[in-house]
Interface confidence: low
Amino acid sequence: QPRSPKSKRKGQGRPGPLAPGPHQVPLDLVSRMKPYARMEEYERNIEEMVAQLRNSSELAQRKCEVNLQLWMSNKRSLSPWGYSINHDPSRIPVDLPEARCLCLGCVNPFTMQEDRSMVSVPVFSQVPVRRRLCPPPPRTGPCRQRAVMETIAVGCTCIF
């Protein structure tokens, strides 16, 4: 029963940023990156972040504005960013938080208004993920996992 192979993204997926450890303020990603002793711990923390993201309208905000009242660095930045969930069924974890710039320009620190003479750009980092690689039909053999590094947006910065 051969069928056409499924289209798969190989290494260009853009998973979300590294997760915070226990007892740390979640999703304050720029200041909270840390190494993980075990892949399981890393993946579990990613899952927790995704759950928070699903439950938080604040984190998924799409407005270009700075909010100095919030503790989250992503909303206090002059190039603020929010998070979306990057879903890829062939990847483990399947869901990853991904930074998304909220402004085309940057926020002018004096006027607190968007200034289009500057540009907000994503900052990328590499994170470890596992990919399920399945032979196309006819599948003579099982799917396999491969550990790969994928480039992801972890935040945004302002450039001239």
Epitope: Q1, G141, P142, C143
Partner: antibody, heavy 118, light 106 residues
Framework: QVTLKESGPGILQPSQTLSLTCSFS??????????VGWIRQPSGKGLEWLAH???????YYNPALKSRLTISKDTSKNQVFLKIANVDTADTATYYC??????????WGQGTSVTVSS | QIVLTQSPAIMSASPGEKVTMTCSAS?????MYWYQQKPGSSPRLLIY???NLASGVPVRFSGSGSGTSYSLTISRMEAEDAATYYC?????????FGSGTKLEIK
Amino acid sequence: QVTLKESGPGILQPSQTLSLTCSFSGFSLSTFGMGVGWIRQPSGKGLEWLAHIWWDDDKYYNPALKSRLTISKDTSKNQVFLKIANVDTADTATYYCARMNDGYLYYWGQGTSVTVSS
Amino acid sequence: QIVLTQSPAIMSASPGEKVTMTCSASSSVSYMYWYQQKPGSSPRLLIYDTSNLASGVPVRFSGSGSGTSYSLTISRMEAEDAATYYCQQWSSYPFTFGSGTKLEIK
């Protein structure tokens, strides 16, 4: 915790259709790369792979039995089904279902015994 | 289909003895898998991808081989290792199992 459990009629007569159900928990058959297969073992004999179904509904059958086999799944109920048409005494065996992913059959059900007798 | 021939069909070993059983494939296969089955129980995965130990399997078990010739070794036989061992290939349909090697304790 991953578990699989097979169920079947126990006894049936030659020429009837054998219907087997594999009920599982701890994983989803909608997960990319996941599969569930059926293997049987006549008493005191070796293992024989029968059929397999993948997460995307891709199906494979043992060519020696293909004309008599039908595998299907109900992803929402976490179940996989196998039908064997026109059974005879040679189909008497213990039938196992097992999860296949990432290269091996790691999780197996406890098996269900099927006897074909007139 | 690829036929897997296991030898010996039956063997016995004393506790502490080294045990080696083989699996010969009628055509070249990429990897071999080994399962242990005790009477009244389901098969249990021991070795995957020829030489990798499955989770929870004692380190006295090891696998090796390539092409058409593969083997499973128990470095020091223990009473609980008495069982039937099956090799299996995934390299081409239909997936096939060997006829088994029954290992008894002396």
